[in-house]
Interface confidence: low
């Protein structure tokens, strides 16, 4: 999905009002310095691409993020403020339902959510437009 045409300010507002708090809740009890940020992004469409990948694509050691509160709110924000996003996610959602796993917070998941926090913060920086 190409995130270029999303309403970035509305997504930013959704992040600031709720998603950020849900990410903090998920990370509660973890020191902010515990994980190094290794995933990066440089503009808003790129940041959303990385955020979507880390939030919804199962990875080795962390398969359960998509059912977390912050993930559901992220999905809702993208569906509302990114034209055509919902349609691209139908097949992915159906595939995900077939292999639902037991919800467990692993250290790998905590590390992944720490990366997400960094990506979201980068998303919120003032955007430089191509001139």
């Amino acid at each position: 999905y190409d995130f270029t045409n999303c309403d970035f300010e509305k997504i930013k507002a959704a992040y600031l009002s709720t998603i950020s708090k849900d990410l903090i809740t998920y990370m509660s009890g973890t020191k902010s310095t515990e994980f190094n940020n290794t995933v990066s992004c440089s503009n808003r469409p790129h940041c959303l691409t990385e955020i979507q990948s880390l939030t919804f694509n199962p990875t080795a050691g962390c398969a359960s993020l998509a059912k977390e509160m912050f993930a559901m709110k992220t999905k809702a924000a993208l569906a509302i403020w990114c034209p055509g996003y919902s349609e691209t996610q139908i097949n992915a959602t159906q595939a995900m339902k077939k292999r639902r796993k037991r919800k467990v917070t692993t250290n790998k998941c905590l590390e992944q959510v720490s990366q997400l926090q960094g990506l979201w913060r980068r998303f919120n920086r003032p955007l430089l437009k191509q001139q």
Partner: antibody
């Protein structure tokens, strides 16, 4: 180790242009913004502009708009600042400075050594 | 454009004294960064995002403030602290204050 190495000193005549380079190493060049800041002798720091090496997006200080052009060569991990229609008051040290995310703010955490540009007839 | 005004322009103090540097913004900003510069050198990041000391900065330095008013404080001046300090914001276009020179009295 992050390093920003700038090109050498330049002496230019009024009306000419100057192009200063800033070679980055020790990090992924496209991950962070690059600022350009200048400082005339005995004067304050003056922000000129910023570029995203990822997409070439730029933002300029209105004072320099139309005279300054920021570009990057991603393959060479190098940022460039070109200033045209030089005048004597452009005599200054020109710095490139990486801007990274840290502590909930975007700060200029690594600076080049500076390039002295002298404009004189 | 947000204008940053630093005061005083020059602060003449003796080693061991307390230094208070002020930076005022023409409109509210989220946070303020501070840089130290010594003659012939590039600026060095000193305090990130209002109150976080950069790597290697001694604990005698502290930063505080919010909105339009920010402060850098040096609890007890050491000889190596005498330098020029600049505040900087990055809320919209980036911008620096005019600097405060901390000199030996």
């Amino acid at each position: 180790e992050v390093q920003l190495v700038q090109s050498g000193a330049e002496v230019k005549k009024p009306g000419a242009s100057v192009k200063v380079s800033c070679k980055a190493s020790g990090y992924t060049f496209t991950d962070d913004y690059m600022n350009w800041v200048r400082q005339a002798p005995g004067q304050r720091l003056e922000w000129m502009g910023i570029i995203s090496p990822y997409n070439g997006g730029t933002s300029y200080n209105q004072k320099f708009k139309g005279r300054v052009t920021l570009t990057v060569d991603k393959s060479a991990s190098t940022a460039y600042m070109e200033l045209s229609s030089l005048r004597s008051e452009d005599t200054a040290v020109y710095y490139c400075a990486r801007e990274d995310y840290d502590y909930d703010g975007y700060a200029m955490d690594y600076w080049g050594q500076g390039t002295t540009v002298t404009v004189s007839s | 454009e947000i204008v940053l005004t630093q005061s005083p322009a020059t602060l003449s103090l003796s080693p061991g004294e307390r230094a208070t540097l002020s930076c005022r913004a023409s409109s509210s900003v989220s946070y303020m960064h501070w840089y130290q510069q010594k003659p012939g050198q590039a600026p060095r990041p000193w305090i990130y995002a209002t109150s976080n000391l950069a790597s290697g900065v001694p604990a005698r330095f502290s930063g505080s403030g919010s909105g339009t008013s920010y402060t850098l404080t040096i609890s007890r001046l050491e000889p190596e602290d005498f330098a020029v300090y600049y505040c900087q914001q990055s809320d919209n276009v980036r911008g620096f204050g005019g600097g405060t020179k901390v000199e030996i009295k």
